[in-house]
Interface confidence: low
């Protein structure tokens, strides 16, 4: 029996890419490239966790370039199988020898783009309730090995208060962790810097986030409140709008009051601060009121809480559903208009 020299194949598995959003599509293709071997019979077998898979190998195609041949075989997997941590192997038998390459879903190294955010206290908590808190938010964690740790510190080295932690599973099966730290009103106003340090076994290094009082120019908000006119078909409901503009910095709290009572935040919808054409910021706030409310007392107050507002960090404007009644009242209380 004469033995002849042959060039053994190189076996490499390639994997189809994720979709545009970085998620796995419903099916994943694995491509086994068997390249650079002396032409001859080869057998390709796919294994799942070491077990031979019953797959159609008719898709395997062979090409020859010069003296060497290449073959490729494709395996289509469901997303479920790919995500289930199984190992897939392309096993090639050639000239009595076995060559193989294996692959599996990579561990989420970050995990999967974990992000951390640190908020400043709301002006309402800071100036009205006088119990400010800051929140460290960690999103997009896998519910996997090792707990995420959030630790607080102060740039001054002074001790921090006791924080409260909350963990929430999102619809997409990721984990969101928040840690809320009470801070001293005076410490915050005097410019203390607070740091949140996030550690997790899957993170290549700790994430650090810090927050402090915003520096830069200050400007008090201007507040304007309006009532929309009656609309056909909605006589028992009205929308009140409040424009708050030209304030700096952007931290602001908006409240609506009726009968001297603050309405729940869920009652109104307020935009995030947006930059004006100048150097300040503006927000819009929208409140729906019912006939029962305005017939009880037709005065609603839009209040902005902002550090530059004086004397008590608040600016407010009253608005009525039927402003013509206000005109009569004002005229009746003042001098006769003639």
């Amino acid at each position: 029996v004469c033995s002849r020299d042959f060039t053994p194949p190189t076996v490499k598995i390639l994997q189809s890419s994720c979709d545009g959003g970085g998620h796995f599509p419903p099916t994943i293709q694995l491509l086994c490239l068997v390249s650079g071997y002396t032409p001859g019979t080869i057998n390709i077998t796919w294994l799942e966790d070491g077990q031979v898979m019953d797959v159609d190998l008719s898709t395997a195609s062979t090409t020859q370039e010069g003296e060497l041949a290449s073959t490729q075989s494709e395996l289509t997997l469901s997303q479920k199988h790919w995500l289930s941590d199984r190992t897939y192997t392309c096993q090639v038998t050639y000239q009595g020898h076995t060559f193989e390459d294996s692959t599996k879903k990579c561990a989420d190294s970050n995990p999967r783009g974990v992000s951390a955010y640190l908020s400043r206290p709301s002006p309402f908590d800071l100036f009205i309730r006088k119990s400010p808190t800051i929140t460290c938010l960690v999103v997009d964690l896998a519910p996997s090995k090792g707990t995420v740790n959030l630790t607080w510190s102060r740039a001054s080295g002074k001790p921090v208060n006791h924080s409260t932690r909350k963990e929430e599973k999102q619809r997409n099966g990721t984990l969101t962790v928040t840690s809320t730290l009470p801070v001293g009103t005076r410490d915050w106003i005097e410019g203390e810097t607070y740091q949140c340090r996030v550690t997790h076994p899957h993170l290549p290094r700790a994430l650090m986030r810090s927050t402090t009082k915003t520096s830069g120019p200050r400007a008090a908000p201007e507040v304007y409140a309006f009532a929309t006119p009656e609309w056909p078909g909605s006589r028992d409901k009205r929308t009140l709008a409040c424009l708050i503009q030209n304030f700096m910095p952007e931290d602001i709290s908006v409240q609506w009051l009726h009968n001297e009572v603050q309405l729940p935040d869920a009652r109104h919808s307020t935009t995030q601060p947006r930059k004006t054409k100048g150097s300040g910021f503006f927000v819009f706030s929208r409140l729906e009121v019912t006939r029962a409310e305005w017939e009880q007392k037709d005065e609603f107050i839009c209040r902005a809480v902002h550090e530059a507002a004086s004397p008590s960090q608040t600016v407010q404007r009253a608005v009525s559903v039927n402003p013509e009644l206000d005109v009569c009242v004002e005229e009746a209380e003042g001098e006769a208009p003639w």
């Epitope: 479920k80 289930s84 996997s144 963990e167 599973k169 984990l175």
Partner: antibody, heavy 119, light 111 residues
Amino acid sequence: QVQLVQSGAEVKKPGSSVKVSCKASGYTFNGYWMHWVRQAPGQGLEWIGYINPTTGHTEYNQKFKDKATITADESTNTAYMELSSLRSEDTAVYYCARQEYRHSWFAYWGQGTLVTVSS
Amino acid sequence: DIQLTQSPSSLSASVGDRVTITCRASQSVDYDGDTYMNWYQQKPGKAPKLLIYAASNLDSGVPSRFSGSGSGTDFTLTISSLQPEDFATYYCQQTNEDPWTFGQGTKVEIK
């Protein structure tokens, strides 16, 4: 391969408690949420709640908040659900099911554990 | 809670028939571009088995005669040509909002 193997059937007296186990194998136990679902005789499926085995964090269907307690033991790759103050209405098959990471469906289920409450 | 109403509750069909089961949600189960609706098959004495996830994706190993469609509040599970092994109870499930809920089930029986 992924397997969820539950403890055997139980017969319990009203007022007592029972602890059902679900042993996971073939995957990284603490990389996935473990849920529990119940099915009363001849009835449909009801979601009870879940646990994150890593942190022990649990969420419950309000209906079962005072009935079920879900725990997990990472060292043995086992999830547990304890049912307290048993009543005849708690007679059902209880399933554990694994939720896929970043997805909201149950691809793998335990075989089910029948809990019968009878005096 | 989101209520899921399946119809019909039961149906009799023959091998080779095309079978359609609908599931209506009391509110939308779409969120941020994804649809949180799944379908399961359950045979007596067995655990449920995933058939369709995210409204229209066929789970691996599930025959292509099964298909799912829909978005928002209205969903359909279709079996294009009923086979003897398909006689079972089918459940829809929403996972858009806690508590996750299931439909009451549709029993497919032999005519």
